[in-house]
């Protein structure tokens, strides 16, 4: 058993049919010695008396808020949560496996630049009685500070018969140098509590590996005289690290017909303009990627040819 | 990444082309190592990230762009005088360049070159003949060092009398390639910045 926060405790349980329970001794936080009784949750029934209560925690029916009282007055609370371990593996019932980029990916993180700011998100089908708390650091043995905000519900989607909820959190490394070469990864730890179930999820990454620039901005077409060609121009996204001559991007320009089956023409360039042939009803899209370190491409920025 | 990239004009900052070749070569070599050594811990997640130049050179700090000198987190061990020698700087105003930048890059290349050559000598003794260093990568390191044109003492190649542990050597190769790729990215950024100045 360990303390998650004040008056909230996590009991770690091996979860198999003939597993023994965990013996837990609860102590009432009071100088009083006599006349103390214990109750659980909303029930007014007395579970035991005395300054300590020894319980066997085996089921979610044994978890909950234990309260000690004296003469009708509440003295203290202890909320017990359960953390299940099945076949030596901690349970992952609360979050959905996003399976990208690999199986058992519960947390996904992205950064728009090298400033040390990043966003992580996760998915669940649970809609109520759910809380998250996020901690992060650079390295684990001698951790350096990363500050994370509160996790918030960022999207709701219908997936077949189920509703899916996306939560996200923004974190900022306390003293980040955009030009630094990372040797210690960022560690992100998410505590998830659903009703009386506790689970924790972790992700470890280098900012350089989770970079995904915003799409190029101000995408414009300039027709070239007496030609089907157009000059496409764009700019670096505002959120990209500066100076741009140091943090350079490379671009992919794509001409896509109305039909998905039509052949796509693609050009790669380090410049912020390109000359392409604009077909009728086609659209021109541009996306960006770090020029020197191949992490993710940005989403496409698009304009119609017409 | 096999993308069409224009060859730089001869008038360009001379080292940019070499640094781009370096990054391409080390990335290809790392990819080859990851594929060949698929049963070894050779991915970014599996290896320990060691920097053989740590405490010996200060490339990141010395080559910091002017715009980032206002960022206190970037100013750990920065020098502030400016570089004046080295042929890469020919006909370029280099007021943004901090002391030791290009010489620091040169020292990095020299250290990695020695490590890679020593390692290659060991790998050539491996009866499995599983992996060797790409000669192209070693040649590109050499070319960039020549372009930087710093006069520096030659470092003798390390020689070892004991029988090499090939498993450890291959893991060390992965660690070295990952670190060198990261340094090659920094070098490319610096050269690109220099070129634009």
């Amino acid at each position: 058993i360990w303390e998650l926060k004040k008056d909230v405790y996590v009991v770690e349980l091996d979860w198999y049919p003939d597993a023994p329970g965990e013996m837990v001794v609860l102590t009432c936080d009071t100088p009083e010695e006599d006349g103390i009784t214990w109750t659980l949750d909303q029930s007014s029934e007395v579970l035991g008396s005395g300054k300590t209560l020894t319980i066997q925690v085996k089921e979610f029916g044994d978890a909950g808020q234990y309260t000690c009282h004296k003469g009708g007055e509440v003295l203290s609370h202890s909320l017990l949560l359960l953390h299940k371990k099945e076949d030596g593996i901690w349970s992952t019932d609360i979050l959905k496996d996003q399976k990208e980029p690999k199986n058992k990916t519960f947390l996904r993180c992205e950064a728009k630049n090298y400033s040390g700011r990043f966003t992580c998100w996760w998915l669940t089908t649970i809609s109520t009685d759910l809380t998250f708390s996020v901690k992060s650091s650079r390295g684990s043995s001698d951790p350096q500070g990363v500050t994370c905000g509160a996790a918030t519900l960022s999207a709701e989607r219908v997936r077949g018969d189920n509703k899916e909820y996306e939560y996200s959190v923004e974190c900022q490394e306390d003293s980040a140098c955009p030009a630094a070469e990372e040797s210690l990864p960022i560690e992100v730890m998410v505590d998830a509590v659903h009703k009386l179930k506790y689970e924790n999820y972790t992700s470890s990454f280098f900012i350089r590996d989770i970079i995904k620039p915003d799409p190029p901005k101000n995408l414009q077409l300039k027709p070239l005289k007496n030609s089907r060609q157009v000059e496409v121009s764009w700019e670096y996204p505002d959120t990209w690290s500066t100076p741009h001559s140091y943090f350079s991007l490379t671009f992919c320009v794509q001409v896509q017909g109305k039909s998905k089956r039509e052949k796509k023409d693609r050009v790669f360039t380090d410049k912020t303009s390109a000359t392409v042939i604009c077909r009728k009803n086609a659209s021109i899209s541009v996306r960006a990627q770090d020029r020197y370190y191949s992490s993710s491409w940005s989403e496409w920025a698009s304009v119609p040819c017409s | 990444r096999n993308l069409p990239v224009a060859t730089p004009d001869p008038g360009m900052f001379p080292c940019l082309h070499h640094s781009q070749n370096l990054l391409r070569a080390v990335s290809n070599m790392l990819q080859k190592a990851r594929q060949t050594l698929e049963f070894y811990p050779c991915t970014s997640e599996e290896i320990d990230h060691e920097d053989i130049t740590k405490d010996k050179t200060s490339t990141v700090e010395a080559c910091l762009p002017l715009e980032l000198t206002k960022n206190e987190s970037c100013l750990n061990s920065r020098e502030t005088s400016f570089i004046t020698n080295g042929s890469c700087l020919a006909s370029r105003k280099t007021s943004f360049m901090m002391a030791l930048c290009l010489s620091s890059i040169y020292e990095d290349l020299k250290m990695y070159q020695v490590e890679f050559k020593t390692m290659n000598a060991k790998l050539l003794m491996d009866p499995k003949r599983q992996i060797f260093l790409d000669q192209n990568m070693l040649a590109v390191i050499d070319e960039l060092m020549q372009a930087l044109n710093f006069n520096s003492e030659t470092v003798p190649q390390k020689s070892s009398l004991e029988e090499p542990d090939f498993y450890k050597t291959k893991i060390k190769l992965c660690i070295l390639l990952h670190a060198f790729r990261i340094r090659a990215v920094t070098i490319d950024r610096v050269m690109s910045y220099l070129n634009a100045s």
Epitope: P20, D41, L47, G48, Q56, Y66 | -
Partner: antibody, heavy 119, light 107 residues
Framework: EVQLVQSGAEVKKPGESLKISCQSS????????IGWVRQMPGQGLEWIGI????????RYNPMFRGQVTMSVDKSSSTAYLQWSSLKASDTAMYYC????????????WGQGTMVTVSS | DIQMTQSPSSLSASVGDRVTITCKAS??????LAWYQQKPGKAPKSLIY???SRQSGVPSRFSGSGSGTDFTLTISSLQPEDFATYYC?????????FGQGTKLEIK
């Protein structure tokens, strides 16, 4: 006052289905799991299993798994034990009981439902 | 499954007698043991839990002791209403199991 009131005695033929009930009152139904115990004529007590009234989480005795089904209706504070195809060997007294949290034993018992299966 | 063995299977005693019933577990169950009393035609009633804690409302003449594998239920001075069958139950490891019962009769 804590009370567990069980449905009346049943006489059934082999192969028939049956669902017996246990209605709870006098306490917070969702705080306490409900269990079932079998007592064959002239025999001792056998633990069938327990169930959470909150989310229908169930622990069956392997000996009874597949033979009986436990269920619960939170809105009426009622637990159920059912058979899809009765056998003569299911003839017994069935007790529902309230599981004590933080312990696991049964602190309050229903009066029992006698199930007789005979052709 | 854990086997619970009670002894004796039955015993005769008189009002005012001190009676001891024992229960042996086939493996260590800590203190997670309960005792129940059942009268003919009635549901069992909880007497003792955690090997030695009395259920509220149970007279003080009933006491439990033991831990691990050996447990006892003691009735210090038999009363006429105590003649019944007594069961022990371990609730440490699933499936929870009962002893075969000890029938206490009037001598």
């Amino acid at each position: 006052e804590v009370q567990l009131v069980q449905s009346g005695a049943e006489v059934k033929k082999p192969g028939e289905s049956l669902k017996i009930s246990c209605q709870s009152s006098g306490y917070s139904f969702t705080t306490y799991w409900i269990g079932w115990v079998r007592q064959m004529p002239g025999q001792g007590l056998e633990w069938i299993g327990i169930m959470s009234p909150v989310d229908s989480d169930i622990r069956y005795n392997p000996m009874f798994r597949g033979q009986v089904t436990m269920s619960v209706d939170k809105s009426s504070s009622t637990a159920y034990l059912q058979w899809s195809s009765l056998k003569a060997s299911d003839t017994a007294m069935y007790y529902c009981a309230r599981r004590r949290p933080g312990q696991g034993y049964f602190d309050f018992w229903g009066q029992g439902t006698m199930v007789t299966v005979s052709s | 499954d854990i086997q619970m063995t009670q002894s004796p299977s039955s015993l005769s005693a008189s009002v005012g007698d001190r009676v001891t019933i024992t229960c042996k577990a086939s493996q260590n169950v800590g203190s997670w043991l309960a005792w129940y009393q059942q009268k003919p035609g009635k549901a069992p009633k909880s007497l003792i839990y955690s090997a030695s804690s009395r259920q509220s409302g149970v007279p003080s003449r009933f006491s439990g002791s033991g831990s691990g594998t050996d447990f006892t239920l003691t009735i210090s001075s038999l009363q006429p209403e105590d003649f019944a069958t007594y069961y022990c139950q371990q609730y440490d490891i699933y499936p929870f199991t009962f002893g075969q019962g000890t029938k206490l009769e009037i001598k």
